[in-house]
């Protein structure tokens, strides 16, 4: 009896694992084995595919074959018993195009209100992704184990920290990789769960802001308690993208070590041009907080995004605010040649209730004010470019009294 060729051959490639699956064409014939040959582009001869010779099952692994993953390859299969079937040719394919990204490895660390996620490619030193190792981005799905309500976080790198979590709570997450340059989305990792710790005695510092004063950077933050000491550390932001790196060498800012105030001042020349991450930690001598949220600090933007300068013309029921270019040291205006949006906050001097106006124009009317009342105004600038999503610090507050009634014209 003539043996029939196997049919429906599927090639599955995940990272560096090359798996072939096929259907037997005749289930009634026993003790059949299967063998594959392969042929590279531009070659006439067929070569035996190692790992896929005389296979009794309908699956084989040819990962040991050292292929150029960017080169087209053709496969053929036949069945063998006493005689052999005719060859069945599989459509040619390029391994890299066909490959899927496997599940990444995930490592979790817990704090009281944060989880640190370290992600690395599932296959170490992968041949398939050798040229793309630095291009991996990751996305994750996280949920409270008790509720199951999922939150998605896109475009993260090999180290990511999730903040604002609840203490003593189990969170579960899964991660997948993507190579956006090749339009490839990977397979999710297994689900990893971790429980956040009991609440730490000292909370971390909050609301960290960097501003420029003269030739110095001024770093400010908020803290709940008095009589504390603080330290500030920095890290090159690009290091978070390095997939092989699990050690983040955070460095001290010398002028911000063991400071007793909620701010520190350090020379601009401490940092070369670049993007950095900054974090702050508090200590009372006995206990230490966890690190604050990490803020991104771009020297280029920081250097030129200064708080706006403005004048107020007071009327009885409104203020007219004229926004000008911020002043550098030496009172020279800074030329800012990129679009800005202004956030103006105003409040009655005797009240804490703030109102906000967002405006692209440099002349702004603040309406609906009461006559003969002192109002305070502060403003800050935001870049409108999404890539340079940056805000200046707020200007100092300026307080003015509105005029008596009927002077609004």
């Amino acid at each position: 009896k003539n043996l029939k060729s196997p049919q429906k051959v599927e090639v599955d490639i995940i990272d560096d694992n090359f798996i072939l699956r096929w259907n037997r064409s005749d289930e009634s014939v026993g003790n059949v084995t299967f063998s594959f040959d392969y042929q590279k582009t531009g070659m006439d001869n067929w070569i035996k595919l190692s790992g896929c010779q005389n296979i009794t099952s309908t699956k084989c692994n040819f990962s040991s074959l050292k292929l150029n993953v960017y080169e087209e390859i053709k496969l053929r299969i036949r069945a063998e018993k006493e005689n052999t079937s005719s060859w069945y040719e599989v459509d040619s394919f390029t391994p890299f195009r066909k490959a899927q990204i496997g599940p990444p490895e995930v490592h979790l660390e817990a704090e009281d209100k944060a989880i640190v996620i370290h992600i690395s490619p599932g296959t170490k030193d992968s041949v398939m992704w050798a040229l793309d190792g630095l291009s991996f981005t990751y996305s994750l799905v996280i949920w409270k184990n008790s509720s199951g309500v999922e939150e998605r976080i896109e475009n993260i790198y090999s180290r990511h920290k999730i903040y604002k979590l609840s203490p003593e709570t189990t969170y579960c997450l899964k991660v997948k990789a993507a190579l956006l340059t090749s339009w490839k989305i990977g397979v999710y990792s297994p689900v990893h769960c971790i429980k956040t710790t009991v609440e730490n005695e000292l909370p971390p510092p909050e609301n960290i802001e960097v501003s420029v004063q003269n030739q110095n950077y001024v770093l400010k933050w908020d803290y709940t308690y008095a009589n504390m000491t603080f330290q500030v550390q920095w890290l090159h932001a690009f290091l978070k993208r390095n997939p092989g790196n699990h050690l983040y060498k955070w460095k001290q800012i010398p002028d911000c070590e063991n400071v007793k105030t909620t701010q520190c001042v350090f020379p601009q020349n401490v940092f070369q041009k670049g993007i950095y991450l900054l974090r702050v930690q508090a200590s009372d001598g006995n206990n230490t907080s966890f690190w604050s949220e990490e803020i991104k600090f771009d020297t280029e933007i920081q250097a030129f995004l200064l708080p706006p300068v403005f004048n107020i013309r007071s009327l009885s029921d409104s203020f007219h605010i004229y926004i000008g270019a911020p002043k550098q040291s030496g009172n020279t205006p800074v030329i800012q040649d990129y679009p800005l949006i202004y956030e103006i906050i105003f409040w009655e001097n005797t009240s804490n209730a703030e109102r906000k106006i967002i405006e692209k124009k440099t002349d702004v009317t603040v309406p609906n004010l009461k006559p003969l009342t002192v109002y305070c105004v502060k403003a800050r600038a935001h870049t409108m470019d999404e890539k340079l999503n940056k805000s200046s610090v707020f200007s100092d507050a300026v307080c003015e009294k509105t005029k008596p009634g009927n002077t609004s014209k």
Epitope: E109, H246, L247, Y248
Partner: antibody, heavy 118, light 107 residues
Framework: EVHLQQSGAELVKPGTSLKLSCTAS????????IHWVKQRTEQGLEWIGR????????KYAPTFQGKATITADTSSNTAYLQLSSLTSEDTAVYYC???????????WGQGTTLTVSS | DIVMTQSQKFMSTSEGDRVSVTCKAS??????VVWYQQKPGQSPKALIY???YRYSGVPDRFTGSGSGTDFTLTISNVQSEDLAEYFC?????????FGAGTKLELK
């Protein structure tokens, strides 16, 4: 294969100084922190300090400040621990260890036995 | 400095038993805890990192658990080669500190 090879046992007199070495193979010390740990006979482990060989930045335990100086030479892939004004209290085994971020001290040297005796 | 307390200096066990070594931190150290095994005349061998992750090559009878201030190393089905001293260490904040050690011995 990752390996940390430490210098041999030492017998020295009180009041002297000594430099112990720890030579790494199988990895570049610039990519890690190298830590030093002290262990006295029948006692626990005491952390001495660490160095970032990339830029020489060091941190020390308060009890070893002034006693220990950690340095590194990236060209020979070696870290050093210098101990000064030695006394019998410094008699111990000294270990170097590689620190790999979240996975802690993943590789240790075999230890150097230091005996301080007159 | 953070104090790591291993309250039991010695623990007696028999082959095949399950034993738990505990370690308490004086402050919240998250999950930044390592467990080491040390045999006489040898350097410490890392077993568990990040409180619960096993180093490669470590038998799966060794498991770590805990977070914050309370940590446990459990050895299920104790083997004779597990008789050694076990140390915990925190690497959350400088100075890094070790527990005093717990010696596992045969009953």
């Amino acid at each position: 294969e990752v390996h940390l090879q430490q210098s041999g046992a030492e017998l020295v007199k009180p009041g002297t100084s000594l430099k112990l070495s720890c030579t790494a193979s199988g990895f570049n010390i610039k990519d890690y922190y190298i830590h030093w740990v002290k262990q006295r006979t029948e006692q626990g482990l005491e952390w001495i300090g660490r160095i970032d060989p990339e830029d020489g930045e060091t941190k020390y335990a308060p009890t070893f400040q002034g006693k220990a100086t950690i340095t590194a030479d990236t060209s020979s892939n070696t870290a050093y621990l210098q101990l000064s004004s030695l006394t019998s209290e410094d008699t111990a085994v000294y270990y170097c260890a590689r620190y790999n971020g979240y996975s802690g001290f993943d590789y240790w040297g075999q230890g150097t036995t230091l005996t301080v005796s007159s | 400095d953070i104090v790591m307390t291993q309250s039991q200096k010695f623990m007696s066990t028999s082959e095949g038993d399950r034993v738990s070594v505990t370690c308490k931190a004086s402050q919240n150290v998250g999950t930044n805890v390592v467990w080491y095994q040390q045999k006489p005349g040898q350097s410490p061998k890392a077993l568990i990192y990040s409180a619960s992750y096993r180093y490669s090559g470590v038998p799966d009878r060794f498991t770590g658990s805990g977070s914050g201030t309370d940590f446990t190393l459990t050895i299920s089905n104790v083997q004779s080669e597990d008789l050694a001293e076990y140390f915990c260490q925190q690497y959350n904040r400088y100075p890094f500190t070790f527990g005093a050690g717990t010696k596992l011995e045969l009953k």
